[in-house]
Amino acid sequence: EEELQMIQPEKLLLVTVGKTATLHCTVTSLLPVGPVLWFRGVGPGRELIYNQKEGHFPRVTTVSDLTKRNNMDFSIRISSITPADVGTYYCVKFRKGSPENVEFKSGPGTEMALGAKPSAPVVLGPAARTTPEHTVSFTCESHGFSPRDITLKWFKNGNELSDFQTNVDPTGQSVAYSIRSTARVVLDPWDVRSQVICEVAHVTLQGDPLRGTANLSEAIRVPPTLEVTQQPMRVGNQVNVTCQVRKFYPQSLQLTWSENGNVCQRETASTLTENKDGTYNWTSWFLVNISDQRDDVVLTCQVKHDGQLAVSKRLALEVTVHQKDQSSDATP
């Protein structure tokens, strides 16, 4: 004959205020005959939570039909949970006695604690943009969770980061806790399309972590590289000069041409293209009149990117006698 065991599978049950808590208790044997009661706490001061025979327990219902003689499930549900309900709950088998029933065997107990889900993590990046090869800091915050135990991870494009520091406050007992973590991320030139993810795992989330994201496009500045080239002449007395501004981000860019130090208003044409890595290329063409020009024309392409100091590239125009004499129907 199997010895009776009282099984309470959960050591800890996290519940939310206002919700219904299910406290599980099963027995391994129908014998000996006798009632199963629920208590909160132990000893003489323990509180009766449910007795199928006596008392009024409006918030308590049984999960199974206790009238079935082969019933081995004595689990109960407690509705409308309040902070006053926290404590350790025991299902206890009794043998009928006179004048009082006799405690026969108790379950190991289930601690009911108030659980609160963490808020969605909010990830904030640096206030100002930084160039590649530099380190930037991202912060992640989540609030209002309980119990205190929580796991936070950082990822960059799916790869876990290790350079971060995390604090959970307060350190002592509290109804709810907050987490703040700061991760240090080294920027790569291709990070325009990269993302950092802050992932928070908590017992109340049932294995479905919360995530907060930030785009590195908000934190990175990729400075342009400039190249000024002279094109073969296309039309009579004009030379086409190209300024290629490559691999910059963000798009904010001002380009000006100078001829021998004098800013020119005219710009023949320009195109903006986006690269696969999210950076941009800008090409500007400038037509220089070379009829009656001296040989010492210096063209400057100046670029002011994202409010930074201007960078420029010069080109000393090479105009050969042959070019000056070329007819208007010359081909490149």
């Epitope: 004959e1 000996p32 005959v33 006798g34 025979k53 206790l66 009238t67 009928k96 006179s98």
Partner: antibody, heavy 119, light 107 residues
Framework: QVQLVQSGAEVKKPGASVKVSCKAS????????INWVRQAPGQGLEWMGW????????NYAQKLQGRVTMTRDTSTSTVYMELSSLRSEDTAVYYC????????????WGQGTLVTVSS | DIQMTQSPSSLSASVGDRVTITCRAS??????LAWYQQKPGKAPKLLIY???SLESGVPSRFSGSGSGTDFTLTISSLQPEDFATYYC?????????FGGGTKVEIK
């Protein structure tokens, strides 16, 4: 299968005592309690008392208090009911009945023992 | 003590009839009530426990209902073997008490 077998009929004189036995088989006595119920000729059922199969604890009907004793012998799986100072109104069929669940109904009954009290 | 009042004390019915027996407790006993059937010269037999739970092996024409103080035993279609005396019993608290019984006779 579960069975409760009671001792045979008894004829007793007023003032005497009677001890009725109830032997349980097909289950462990320790796991179930026993009620004793009697029925006078042509009358209804009357609860006499209860004995715990667990520890021998008892509870008796007020009107029989001091005259009734219920005991058990786990080694022989037998429960006993002794009634002393017999009177003619104690003439009845005496039943032992097993308490079947925590709802405390009597799911198995002995065949009954007729006790006749007559001078 | 909790008094159990059973009614009627006797009734005559025919095979196939629907029969209803009531039992009233002097105070609330929730669902702590059992019904028994007894035939002459035999020990009682459990029919219903916990007010409405049918004992294993008992035909489904027997049913119990009620809670608190008022309870009913119903035989949906009386069979020849159902002519007997029926007792209710409160199992809520000591002293356990029985109703006076209802004798179901052939009309």
């Amino acid at each position: 299968q579960v069975q409760l077998v009671q001792s045979g009929a008894e004829v007793k004189k007023p003032g005497a005592s009677v001890k009725v036995s109830c032997k349980a088989s097909g289950y462990t006595l320790n796991n179930y309690d026993i009620n004793w119920v009697r029925q006078a000729p042509g009358q209804g059922l009357e609860w006499m008392g209860w004995i715990s199969g667990y520890n021998g604890n008892t509870n008796y009907a007020q009107k029989l208090q001091g005259r009734v004793t219920m005991t058990r012998d786990t080694s022989t799986s037998t429960v006993y009911m002794e009634l002393s100072s017999l009177r003619s109104e104690d003439t009845a069929v005496y039943y032992c009945a097993r308490v079947g669940s925590s709802w405390e109904e009597n799911d198995q009954w002995g065949q009954g023992t007729l006790v006749t009290v007559s001078s | 003590d909790i008094q159990m009042t059973q009614s009627p004390s006797s009734l005559s019915a025919s095979v196939g009839d629907r029969v209803t027996i009531t039992c009233r407790a002097s105070q609330s006993i929730s669902r702590w009530l059992a019904w028994y059937q007894q035939k002459p010269g035999k020990a009682p037999k459990l029919l219903i426990y916990a007010a409405s739970s049918l004992e294993s092996g008992v035909p489904s024409r027997f049913s119990g209902s009620g809670s608190g103080t008022d309870f009913t035993l119903t035989i949906s279609s009386l069979q020849p073997e159902d002519f007997a005396t029926y007792y209710c019993q409160q199992t809520h608290s000591f002293p356990l008490t029985f109703g006076g019984g209802t004798k179901v006779e052939i009309k």
